[in-house]
């Protein structure tokens, strides 16, 4: 399906299309692209309101958008294999036409990190709410659609077309009509701005009867930051209305002259400018010479001007502009510094916090301290960051190696610890008998007991000896039935699981009286170290930067 | 390429006017300000005004107001300037120049090879 | 209207050395928008003149990079790095800042 142009905003140096019509967003940029500009940016609050309102045009006129919400591409971006950057407001996505990273952002949600498709950016209307200038358009990220298959595709798009300059509007001074041609395309009659290079054709009378004249006026630019039409005088001047049609279209005083005829005036302290029609400021602060936040402040008799910048800014070769002073040069800060617009702001690599003496100082952070532990059970802290361990009978576990996991030492790397029956339990385990069989005093052997029906002899239940106190992982006890006594064939499971109040006869025994000699140490400790400090600057000189890092914040780490 | 083909030279007589030439080829004629540029023998360049074809749309400098007149056939892709009530002081090589970019007023990078005006009795 | 200044006469110079000739205005040339609109154009003996440099330090297309502009809002210099014959002729700076466009008087380059 093809777009319409369906409404057209011009303002500052820039003019805004959006149009209706199902396209995925690289035929979107690619119909932009044909007239000389891209999708549209949204780099301030100023420009969405921009976009808004071109939007709110487009929606007045457009009757096929029945969805309650719509949404519209603009020129928002990220390529595939590049993956999500949480830490800045673009989160990692670029504006097609190039530029900078801007500050603004209005997501609609918090975005899931995907490195493995293109993902594309569209504006999110809900038509069933009123287009408020408080109430800016909110960014909603996705596929970027497929050719060919509208089904995938979304309602419209923005494009952006951006210019040296802008004519005002023709000013009519009787009944007339204009009609602007743009470089892009766009007929209108009514813009606030006429871009740079754009037609207007002017036709004078009452509509109903033949048109007296026509004018045809080209916007170009006539010196430095001048464009103009280089008509002389309002149009479509009529003696029966004098100044009384839209003030003769002069842009401040209107004089009439006996004849009909009138002539265009300013107030004091402006001047006539060429088009003998729009007024000027007699004072050189009006034109806005200075720039980036700079204030224009009069000279002595309001003849020359300086520009003077705020504080954090200093104005830089051309006398005009204000540039950031970079604070961050004179290294005011322990670890991080992060320059910012007018300032500066001390930042602590992770594993550190803000404190101690001086101005920018950084802290240890201590992650093992009471009531902010991390680990399941133990916790060294050290210098930027910590690592846990566990006690006896356990491992560490989890993503990040803060949880602790009991060792089922029934099935341990060094085979089966009890002759018989074995049992795990948290943080330990107990050796049991088949019926007939009692545990001999070594609590893992099994001897032959004399014939009883009676409950099984064995040591009182120590089911809770050994167990460690802080472990997250469920208690449970499994009964793994092991090699019986020599010469006796292997005992096979029972259906029901052996619990510790069973007829079974079963022992337990701490774990260090029961490992025998010879056998694998049960006691391990991993500690996997915390390198929480990896992203600050503690990289090795020359060192392979490449491997990937499990962020906090979900994601793969990778830059 | 761009080029810009001027008139012959005019022999003329003092309180007569005179029509000069400047014809473009190699561009697109109506998008481009057309300057005029006045040089006496001997002496340095003077600025007398412009013309934008596609709409007309003129400039002087004050000094040759009411002396020279700028016009322009889209047609034929060719500018105009006219002389009026010409004296010995109208005796100069007039150029016409082009600006460099559509729409825009500056710089001069084409030139014409200049049209020698002699004012004599 | 700004009125351009320059000296009717460049220091003699010697063929493959450098050359400087200079250009005031009594307005600065400087924008807002932080160009320079400051023009330099030869004119060789019986030729039409020839762009050099726009907006004060820009290299026209086709100019050789012996030339070069530079300059404050109000004072400007065109260099040419080492001098060769066919650089004879007249200099003219010229300003497009305000209307009407005002040339100097042009500097006479004078070969040794």
């Known amino acids: 399906t093809g777009a319409d142009t369906e409404a057209v905003v011009c303002v500052g140096t820039a003019c805004y299309t959006a149009h209706s019509g199902k396209l995925s967003a690289a035929e979107a940029q690619n119909h932009c692209n044909q007239n000389g500009g891209n999708l549209a940016t949204v780099k301030s609050k100023e420009e969405a309101q921009h976009v808004q309102r071109v939007l709110a045009q487009l929606l007045r006129r457009e009757a096929a958008l029945t969805a309650r919400m719509s949404k519209f591409w603009i020129g928002l971006q990220r390529e595939k294999g590049k993956c999500l950057d949480p830490s800045l407001p673009l989160k990692g996505f670029s504006w097609v036409g190039g530029g900078e990273d801007t500050p603004y952002s209005n997501w609609h949600k918090e975005l899931r990190n995907s490195c493995i498709s293109k993902r594309c950016v569209s504006l999110l209307l809900d038509l069933s709410q009123p287009l408020l200038p408080s109430r800016l358009p909110k960014w909603s990220e996705g596929p970027c659609g497929s050719p060919g298959s509208p089904g995938s595709n979304i309602e419209g798009f923005v494009c952006k077309f951006s210019f040296k300059g802008m004519c005002r509007p023709l000013a009519l001074g009787g009944p007339g009509q204009v009609t602007y041609t743009t470089p892009f395309q766009t007929t209108s009659s009514s813009l606030e701005a006429v871009p740079f290079a754009s037609a207007a054709n002017v036709a004078c009378g009452e509509g109903d009867k033949d048109e007296t004249q026509s004018h045809y006026f080209l916007c170009k630019e006539k010196a430095p930051d001048v464009f103009d039409w280089g008509s002389s005088g309002p149009l479509c001047v009529s003696p029966k209305y004098g100044c009384n049609f839209n003030n003769g279209g002069c842009h401040q005083d209107c004089f009439e002259g006996g004849d009909g005829s009138f002539l265009c005036g300013c107030r004091p302290g402006f001047r006539l400018l060429d088009d003998l029609v729009t007024c000027a400021s007699r004072n050189p602060c009006s034109s806005s010479p200075c720039r980036g936040g700079a204030t224009c402040v009069l000279g002595p008799h309001g003849k020359n001007y300086t520009c003077r910048c705020p504080q954090g800014y200093q104005l830089d070769s051309s006398q005009l502009d204000c540039v950031d002073v970079d604070e961050c040069q004179d290294s005011p800060c322990a670890q991080e510094c992060v320059n910012t617009p007018g300032g500066f702001r001390c930042e602590c690599w992770v594993g550190y916090e803000p404190g101690g003496p001086g101005e920018g100082a950084c802290q240890d952070v201590d992650e093992c301290a009471l009531g902010r532990s991390p680990c399941a059970q133990g916790c060294t802290n050290t210098d930027g960051s910590f690592h846990c361990s566990c006690e006896e009978g356990y491992v560490l576990a989890g993503e990040d190696g803060t949880q602790c996991q009991d060792v089922d030492e029934c099935v341990g790397p060094g085979g089966p610890l009890c002759d018989s029956l074995c049992f795990n339990t948290q943080g330990s385990f107990h050796c049991g008998c088949l019926p007939g069989w009692v545990l001999a005093p070594n609590g893992v052997s099994c001897t032959m007991g004399p014939v009883s029906l009676g409950p099984p002899s064995g040591p009182p239940d120590e089911e809770d000896k050994g167990e460690k106190e802080g472990s997250t992982v469920p208690r449970a006890a499994t009964a793994s039935p092991t090699r019986g006594p020599e010469g006796t064939p292997k005992a096979t499971p029972t259906t029901s699981r052996p619990s510790l109040s069973s007829d079974a006869p079963i022992t337990s025994a701490p774990l260090k009286m029961l490992a025998p000699s010879g056998s694998p140490g049960v006691w391990r400790e991993p500690s996997i170290h915390h390198a929480t400090a990896a992203s600050g600057p503690q990289e090795p000189a020359g060192g392979d930067s490449s491997v990937a890092t499990q962020n906090n914040d979900g994601t793969d780490g990778q830059k | 390429q761009v080029q810009l083909q001027q008139s012959g030279p005019e022999l003329v007589k003092p309180g007569a006017s005179v029509k000069i030439s400047c014809k473009g080829s190699g561009y697109a004629f109506s998008t481009y300000w057309m300057n005029w540029v006045k040089q006496r023998p001997g002496k340095g360049l003077e600025w007398i005004g412009r013309i934008f074809p596609g709409d007309g749309d003129t400039d002087y400098d004050g000094k040759f107001k009411g002396k020279a007149t700028l016009t322009a056939d889209k047609s034929s892709n060719t500018a105009y300037m006219q002389l009026s009530s010409l004296t010995s002081e109208d005796s100069a090589v007039y150029f016409c120049a082009r600006t460099g970019a559509a729409y825009e007023f500056d710089p001069f990078p084409y030139w014409g090879q200049g049209t020698l005006v002699t004012v004599s009795a | 209207d700004i009125v351009m200044t320059q000296a009717a006469f460049s220091n003699p110079v010697t063929l493959g050395t450098s050359a400087s000739i200079s250009c005031s205005s009594t307005k600065s040339l400087l924008h807002s928008s932080g160009i320079t609109y400051l023009y330099w154009y030869l004119q060789r003996p019986g030729q039409s003149p020839q762009l050099l440099i726009y907006?004060?330090?820009n290299l026209a297309s086709g100019v050789p990079d012996r030339f070069s502009g530079s300059g404050s809002g109000t004072d400007f210099t065109l260099r040419i790095s080492r001098v060769e014959a066919e650089d004879v002729g007249v200099y003219y700076c010229a300003q497009m800042l305000e209307r009407p466009f005002t040339f100097g008087s042009g500097t006479k380059l004078e070969i040794k």
């Open positions: 907006r004060m330090s």
